[in-house]
């Protein structure tokens, strides 16, 4: 988890004066709580944004927007923290919005947004925003939380993002698979425009089943210059072994700026389908 | 966790032997294919060898005869035998479980002149 750049970040608006801090997550009102607090967040929202560093790299962006109650206790608000929480990993960021002057009622509701935490494809995240200063121990809660969950890499707009085409989101390698006779699956895929090594991928599954019956991998070397953009064809053998029919077929890319990590593509083929077979018809009726 | 641990490299004269162990844990080795992987200073990752969960082998170019890739499932560990060494095997050598994308961190092998 990081921010977008380290450019002024800026939380002032029209009769606000406002600045954004980095935070430890632990604001001080945790440890010195304040008699009077003030009420929630209301009306998060969190939408996927996208947004250019200074070096002209796309990255997607969480977008949190939230507004004020309209109750007096804006008068108590000195500020807002913003927590991103990356759930499979558990790490959490935070930023601070410092009020540097009191707010007052006016005849617009209060509205605050930050695009500026960069978020990973294919991840989820909880974001919580806090009013400033939190709660007594027992006091309501005056946060709001709501998980956010962003697209992988097909989707079409995170595919032109930076993190995706580094992980190689651009290459379609078009995966088309055959079965052929003796228990053979011809494999054939587009190459792309590096001169890197591939791996073939086969796994193999019982008809209803999820536990492998057989997993094999076939090396191709790194295509010349010439090859690139044409197809590669390969050949597989597959265990001869009855109802272990249902193939998924992964290719991996090393490509230079992903390495062991590149994104995969996959195609599955079903078991092919078993002729319904009529009841036999018995050659007597028993009497009972 | 899963956890892919190699062993047994280390520094050979040219000509002799080393045998790289990899012990999982979290993770069963059984019925899996398994892949032994190399990294020279300056150039790609590449294949040295790899076994099928069947026990079907295939091994790179530049070690075929040479290098031989097994498995202990009682011991849950994927074994390379390297005989033969020359200069020109030094690398990082990784452990890889390729339909899981699971790697482990590598153990060096430096070969001598």
């Known amino acids: 988890l990081r921010l977008l750049d380290h450019r002024a970040l800026v939380c002032s608006q029209p009769g606000l004066n406002c600045t954004v801090k980095n935070s430890t997550c632990l604001d001080d009102s945790w440890i010195h709580p304040r008699n009077l607090t003030p009420s929630s967040p209301k009306d998060l929202q969190i939408q996927l944004h996208f947004a250019h560093t200074q070096q002209g790299d796309l990255f997607p962006v969480a977008h949190i927007e939230w507004t004020l109650q309209t109750d007096a206790s804006i008068l108590y608000l000195e500020g807002a923290e913003l927590s991103v929480l990356q759930l499979n990993t558990n790490e959490r960021l935070c930023v601070r919005f410092e009020f540097l002057s009191k707010l007052r009622h006016h005849h617009r509701r209060w509205r605050f947004t930050f695009s500026h935490f960069v978020v990973d494809p294919d991840q989820e995240y909880e974001v919580t925003v806090h009013h400033l200063p939190k709660p007594i121990p027992d006091g309501d809660p005056n946060h709001q939380s709501k998980n956010f969950l962003v697209p992988d890499c097909e989707h079409a707009r995170m595919k032109v993002t930076t993190p995706c085409m580094s992980s190689g989101s651009l290459w379609d390698p078009n995966i088309t698979v055959e079965t052929l006779e003796a228990h053979q699956l011809r494999v054939s895929f587009t190459l792309w425009n590096e001169s890197t090594h591939y791996q073939i991928l086969l796994t193999s599954f019982p008809h209803m089943e999820n536990h492998s019956c057989f997993e094999h991998m076939h090396h191709i070397p790194a295509p010349r210059p010439e090859e690139f953009h044409q197809r590669s064809n390969v050949t597989l053998t597959l265990r001869n072994l009855k109802g272990c029919c249902r193939h998924q077929v992964q290719i991996q890319p090393f490509f230079s700026s992903c390495l062991n990590d590149c994104l995969r593509h996959s195609a599955t083929v079903s078991c092919p389908e078993m002729p319904d077979t009529p009841e036999p018809i018995p050659d007597y009726m028993p009497l009972w | 966790e899963v956890q892919l641990v190699e062993s047994g490299g280390g520094l050979v004269q040219a000509g002799g032997s080393l045998r790289l162990s990899c012990a999982a844990s979290?993770?069963?080795?059984?019925?899996?294919?398994m892949a032994w992987y190399r990294q020279a200073p300056g150039k790609q990752r590449e294949l040295v060898a790899q076994?099928?969960?069947?026990?079907?082998?295939n091994y790179g170019d530049p070690v075929k005869g040479r290098f031989t890739i097994s498995r202990d499932n009682a011991k849950n560990t994927v074994y390379l035998q390297m005989n033969s060494l020359k200069p020109e095997d030094t690398a990082v050598y990784y452990c890889?479980?390729?339909?899981?994308?699971?790697w482990g961190q590598g153990t060096q092998v430096t070969v001598s002149s």
């Open positions: 890889n479980a390729p339909l899981y994308n699971y």
């Open positions: 979290g993770f069963t080795l059984s019925d899996r294919a």
């Open positions: 076994v099928n969960s069947i026990g079907s082998t």
